[in-house]
């Protein structure tokens, strides 16, 4: 999947664009909005009818190295009595994000953009029931 | 920066941390090419906290299209299919990384940007604060 070139007619390539070797792109990894803390939607994960836990995955060859993933606590959903109702399903809600992957080939290092799928939380859904003939 | 294990036979000049600017391959490595959540699942309709998906488009960003969730109700759908206002449908917000064209309009020069997106909705029991 390649990053699309700017296709709009009003997007002419400015003279100020940095020269970039063919087949690659220049990426500044000083993050815009980095002053924002990386954090999760804390405090709803336990109050949800489809509660979830968080785990942190760590990879030193990935930027950012820390990615937080949610996991649904139950297969079913929590009812008004606080019990699991297995007639409903807790399902993960997922979102893609970009990371930079560092690859070592011998002594040389290359960088690759990668899309990763992050589970951000869970929601309670009515199950789809397939009737087997 | 991030410290990484290094091949002991390599020259010491290599930085242990990610450099500020890198040249990356134009091909994005991924197995998840479906960016329209309407096609990937129907949870947005089947959830007890259903949501609508709104298209957020920005040609100076990659990906240029991001679908954002907006909860349909303040309450949640109960077993009878009615909205129960004793519960709350709440958007789940997540910070994600995208690419921002920098300088603007340049085809192959980007900067990472952290943005806040609404991914879906979940049904929660409200905390009621009684204001004196």
């Amino acid at each position: 999947r390649k990053i699309p070139k700017v296709g709009h007619t009003f997007f002419q390539k400015p003279e100020s664009c940095p020269p970039v070797p063919g087949g690659s792109m220049k990426l500044d990894i000083g993050i815009i909005n980095e002053n924002q803390r990386v954090s999760m939607s804390r405090n709803i994960e336990s109050r949800s009818t489809s509660p979830w836990n968080y785990t942190v995955t760590w990879d030193p060859n990935r930027y950012p190295s820390e990615v937080v993933q949610a996991q649904c606590r139950n297969l079913g959903c929590i009812n008004a009595q606080g019990k699991e109702d297995i007639s409903m399903n807790s399902v993960p809600i997922q979102q893609e994000t970009l990371v930079v992957r560092r690859k070592h080939q011998g002594c040389s290092v290359s960088f690759q953009l990668e899309k990763v799928l992050v589970t951000v939380g869970c929601t309670c859904v009515t199950p789809v029931i397939h009737h087997v003939q | 920066g991030i410290t990484i294990p290094r091949n002991p036979g390599c020259p010491n000049s290599e930085d242990k941390n990610f450099p500020r600017t890198v040249m990356v391959n134009l091909n994005i490595h991924n197995r998840n090419t479906n960016t329209n959540p309407k096609r990937s699942s129907d949870y947005y309709n089947r959830s007890t906290s259903p949501w609508n998906l709104h298209r957020n488009e920005d040609p100076e960003r990659y990906p240029s299209v991001i679908w954002e969730a907006k909860c349909r109700h303040l309450g949640c759908i109960n077993a009878d299919g009615n909205v129960d206002y004793h519960m709350n449908s709440v958007p789940i917000q997540q910070e994600i990384l995208v690419l921002r064209r920098e300088p603007p309009h340049c085809p192959n020069s980007f900067r990472l940007e952290k943005i806040l997106v609404s991914v879906g909705c979940t049904c929660v029991t409200p905390i009621v604060h009684h204001v004196a």
């Epitope: 939607s41 709803i44 | 954002e68 907006k70 449908s89 958007p91 917000q93 409200p126 604060h129």
Partner: nanobody
Framework: EVQLVESGGGLVQAGGSLRLSCAAD????????MTWFRQVPGKEREFVAH????????YYANSVKGRFTIARDDAKSTVYLQMNSLKPEDTAVYYC????????????????WGQGTQVTVSS
């Protein structure tokens, strides 16, 4: 139905400060992100600041970054907008809104608004 009541607006000299408050009903407040917008007559409502629920950091419009601070007090069901180093171009009606999803800086994503409070900055 959601009730939002803004207060704290007024007339202030350039360089001065004001603190706006937006009180919500407790059931709604603790569960949702809250956002301030502003509007000048004849113009679109403009995003000012967004404070998501709980541990997320706030987001600000570039025009107010470093001058305005959004904060919330869940116990009082109130969101505040501290406005420092005010400029004449900050003159507007300021509205708070409950975030129920969509793109947080787009006014059409919001269904629940306060009545607004007028801020006038004189030079």
């Amino acid at each position: 139905e959601v009730q939002l009541v803004e207060s704290g607006g007024g007339l202030v000299q350039a360089g001065g400060s004001l603190r706006l408050s937006c009180a919500a009903d407790g059931r709604t407040f603790s569960t949702y992100g809250m956002t301030w917008f502003r509007q000048v007559p004849g113009k679109e409502r403009e995003f000012v600041a967004h404070i998501p629920r709980s541990t997320y950091s706030p987001y600000y419009a570039n025009s107010v970054k470093g001058r305005f601070t959004i904060a919330r007090d869940d116990a009082k069901s109130t969101v505040y907008l501290q406005m420092n180093s005010l400029k004449p171009e900050d003159t507007a009606v300021y509205y708070c809104a409950v975030f129920t999803g969509g793109t947080y800086y787009v006014p059409t994503a919001y269904d629940y608004w306060g009545q607004g409070t007028q801020v006038t900055v004189s030079s």
